[in-house]
């Protein structure tokens, strides 16, 4: 059976929006208006692995491009990366460890935890305009909550 | 040090089933991050990833053997299995088991293999 | 399934000569590959990760280089005890393929 993919964008708890920053890169950032068109669209594919009633193993793809958010060990650091993938083979219901995220619900707000890093996350500083990153720590300074928006296809 | 040691291989007629163990000390595959493959090769031939597991028990197959192979693990007895069913010619290969840390892969420690022949 | 062609299935060198291995992936493979060495009866073993990193405790006469599709394990100064059989592994995307391998034979 094909994987079940959805269109959706992401807000952190500040309601800071995501948008390109360079080809390889996210930032975090206050949209309003007009400017709210500039928020990547993410493919949100529902992937194998283990599953439970609030934690969901997702892949986060970019909408019509051949991009995915990875996680890889960067000189001895769990980091986060845009991978680009050849689209005749993504998404696919059997996706590498790297590109999996446990999308975990808690109290109407949505955490991205790596399958592949336990308990590291994906998150955002409190600043304006700073990369999205894998951080590994949860309820202090930089934001681990998101909010979703569905997008029509 | 890491060692790992592959047993349970011998000669089996085709169609009939075999079960491999990788015993291995010097890690634990309870460690997030750690994995551990199956690498066979058939004689005078190359290296063909077969089966993997990870810690959190998460297991990928070759297309060759889907269906037919499955892997698991023991972490209390520091092994991991692979179970062979419907043991086909193409199947004979001596087969090595592996670790590696994290995906992308790279198997840093290697076992020695045991030999699956496949035979009438 | 991406497929990891390494075009010269045998080589013939001498002690100190400059030796490269060459290994092409039919698609991009960002890097993720590896290279190891195998001789008869002994386990085999990790020589470079990442496509240039150097694992712990290989010597330093062996390196790694490439990009894309093309990537190549380069000897600077053959040793006795570099005659092997070298295999590339790609780690992009399952299932993980090797190489055919290449076998360093002496002259």
């Known amino acids: 059976a094909p994987v079940r993919s959805l269109n959706c964008t992401l807000r952190d708890s500040q309601q800071k929006s995501l948008v390109m920053s360079g080809p390889y890169e996210l930032k975090a950032l206050h949209l309003q208006g007009q400017d709210m068109e500039q928020q990547v669209v993410f493919s949100m594919s529902f992937v194998q692995g283990e599953e439970s009633n609030d934690k969901i193993p997702v892949a986060l793809g970019l909408k019509e491009k051949n991009l995915y958010l990875s996680c890889v060990l960067k000189d001895d650091k769990p980091t986060l990366q845009l991978e680009s993938v050849d689209p005749k083979n993504y998404p696919k219901k059997k996706m590498e460890k790297r590109f999996v995220f446990n999308k975990i619900e808690i109290n109407n707000k949505l955490e991205f935890e790596s399958a592949q890093f336990p308990n590291w996350y994906i998150s955002t500083s409190q600043a304006e305009n700073m990369p999205v990153f894998l951080g590994g720590t949860k309820g202090g300074q930089d934001i681990t909550d998101f909010t979703m928006q569905f997008v029509s296809s | 040090q890491v060692q790992l040691v592959e047993s349970g291989g011998g000669v089996v007629q085709p169609g009939r089933s075999l079960r491999l163990s990788c015993a291995f000390s010097?890690?634990?595959?309870?460690?997030?991050?750690?994995?551990v493959g199956w690498i066979r090769q058939a004689p005078g031939k190359g290296l063909e990833w077969v089966a993997h597991?990870?810690?959190?028990?998460?297991?990928s197959y070759a297309d060759s053997v889907k269906g037919r192979f499955t892997i698991s693990k023991d972490n209390s007895k520091n092994t991991v299995y692979l179970q062979m069913n419907s043991l086909r010619a193409e199947d004979t290969a001596v087969y090595f088991c592996?670790?590696?840390?994290?995906?992308?892969?790279?198997?840093?420690?290697w076992g020695q293999g045991t030999l699956v022949t496949v035979s009438s | 399934d991406i497929q990891m062609t390494q075009s010269t299935s045998s080589l013939s060198a001498s002690v100190g000569d400059r030796v490269t291995i060459t290994c092409r992936a039919s698609?991009?493979?960002?890097?993720?590959l590896s290279w190891y060495q195998q001789k008869p009866g002994k386990a085999v073993k990790l020589l470079i990760y990442?496509?240039?990193k150097l694992h712990s405790g290989v010597p330093s006469r062996f390196s790694g280089s490439g990009s894309g599709t093309d990537y190549t394990l380069t000897i600077s100064s053959l040793q006795q005890e570099d005659f092997a059989t070298y295999f590339c592994?790609?780690?992009?995307?399952?299932?993980?393929?090797f190489g055919q391998g290449t076998k360093l034979e002496i002259k």
């Open positions: 698609q991009d493979i960002s890097n993720y």
């Open positions: 597991i990870w810690w959190d028990g998460d297991e």
């Open positions: 592994l790609q780690g992009k995307m399952l299932p993980w393929t």
């Open positions: 592996a670790r590696n840390r994290y995906d992308p892969p790279w198997f840093v420690d």
């Open positions: 010097g890690f634990s595959l309870s460690t997030s991050g750690m994995g």
């Open positions: 990442y496509t240039s």
